[in-house]
Amino acid sequence: MAVTACQGLGFVVSLIGIAGIIAATCMDQWSTQDLYNNPVTAVFNYQGLWRSCVRESSGFTECRGYFTLLGLPAMLQAVRALMIVGIVLGAIGLLVSIFALKCIRIGSMEDSAKANMTLTSGIMFIVSGLCAIAGVSVFANMLVTNFWMSTANMYTGMGGMVQTVQTRYTFGAALFVGWVAGGLTLIGGVMMCIACRGLAPEETNYKAVSYHASGHSVAYKPGGFKASTGFGSNTKNKKIYDGGARTEDEVQSYPSKHDYV
């Protein structure tokens, strides 16, 4: 029960985290005009990974996309790449984790397979979260070190191409969304990895013991076997709790491991 809860919670936390990473990546407010010297401005500038915007007092907002790839600074490209990798890994992780959820039955999937999938998705969530945190941190570091003095817009400013009025930029809302979202995805991933340990069976699990009652062909299978009437008719039933992927008839080939009445 605790394993299912941990796995489910990890999935939900990661889902929220990845949604946050997507939101942060799409947001325009990665950096916003620093209003320290002029808190009452008639023109407010803010910039994202994909475009820069200007909001006027009149209420009009104009956004211009960065319609160049080669002209953009390497650091911005790196941040974009980190965020996209984070989103892709997170999305794949979510897809994998859906099938790995203990509460969802898919065919005759073994718990060992679910454990592996849970671990895989957990690792993906961890890497996704780290990518997001790294991307946001690189951008924040860029803001702190350069403080974007005299920028015309993001790509010319960071390249130092245009010298205009000093417009200082500070952390935008997207950075905080990104940090929190990355952290949540990371936590979700850790929870999935913890859940995986609970899903994976111990190697010391007892193998099935068949009790042959006289006059009946009923095999009693303690340790998680599904009971079946007769051996012949149900030889391909998979075990629920077992480290390997052996079938019942394979188990039956080891008589020394069984006590018969």
Partner: antibody
């Protein structure tokens, strides 16, 4: 055609109060930030106040801060300017204006005269 | 506060001739975010409210004749009337639309010579 019609002007004694109104028609009033601008006889234009479209932000020059209050009622398409502690130097024609792109005052009313005198 | 200084105070130009009005701001009106200059030009005829002519220093308002043009960047701006018409007689004002408080120039009175 866009119409802005100011009212409420008149003669008032120093220290007195007055409330100006500006009724808007033929444009989406709620989408526009609005301003009051005044012009003393024979003088240059002087910006008095601005209010954002959503009523959340108001701006004033130091000369009127604390004495004048700009407000709006989007349901009535009306802009207001409450003027308290009036001084002789507040005597002017008061215009209301709608802000467009570039923070430019795109639409103007005909103005209402406020005279502060004892 | 940004101080707007217009020159000349008055100008007399013959019909059909070019009229040039200058405006200087104490601080740059160029916004780095969109590379636009937040300077506006207005025309005010006697007994009338001002009329918007040009915003963003060079963008003509719809309905304004194309003989009116604006130019300049940073702190120095110019309003040009390429061929003066009788109806252009008015006072012209420049305005800082970049930062509060919005400030206007002293105005230039344009007359026919």
């Amino acid at each position: 055609e866009v119409q802005l019609l100011e009212s409420g002007g008149g003669l008032v004694q120093p220290g007195g109060s007055l409330r100006l109104s500006c009724a808007a028609s033929e444009f989406t009033f709620s989408n526009y930030a609005m301003s009051w601008v005044r012009q003393a006889p024979g003088k240059r234009l002087e910006w008095v106040a601005t209010i954002s479209s959503g009523r959340s932000s108001t701006y004033y020059p130091d000369s009127v801060k604390g004495r004048f209050t700009i407000s709006r009622d989007n349901s009535k398409n009306t802009l207001y300017l409450q003027m308290n502690s009036l001084r002789a130097e507040d005597t002017a024609v008061y215009y209301c204006a709608g802000l467009g792109r570039g923070n430019a005052m795109e639409y103007w009313g005909q103005g209402t005269l406020v005279t502060v005198s004892s | 506060d940004i101080v707007m200084t217009q020159s000349p105070d008055s100008l007399a130009v013959s019909l059909g001739e070019r009229a040039t009005i200058n405006c200087k701001s104490s601080q740059s009106l160029l916004n780095s975010g969109n590379q636009k200059n937040y300077l506006t030009w207005y025309q005010q005829k006697p007994g009338q409210p001002p009329k918007l002519l040009i915003y963003w220093a060079s963008t003509r308002e719809s309905g304004v004749p194309d003989r009116f043009s604006g130019s300049g960047s940073g702190t120095d701006f110019t309003l040009t009337i390429s061929s003066l018409q009788a109806e252009d007689v008015a006072v012209y004002y420049c305005q800082n639309a970049y930062s509060y408080p919005f400030t206007f120039g002293g105005g230039t009175k344009l007359e026919i010579k």
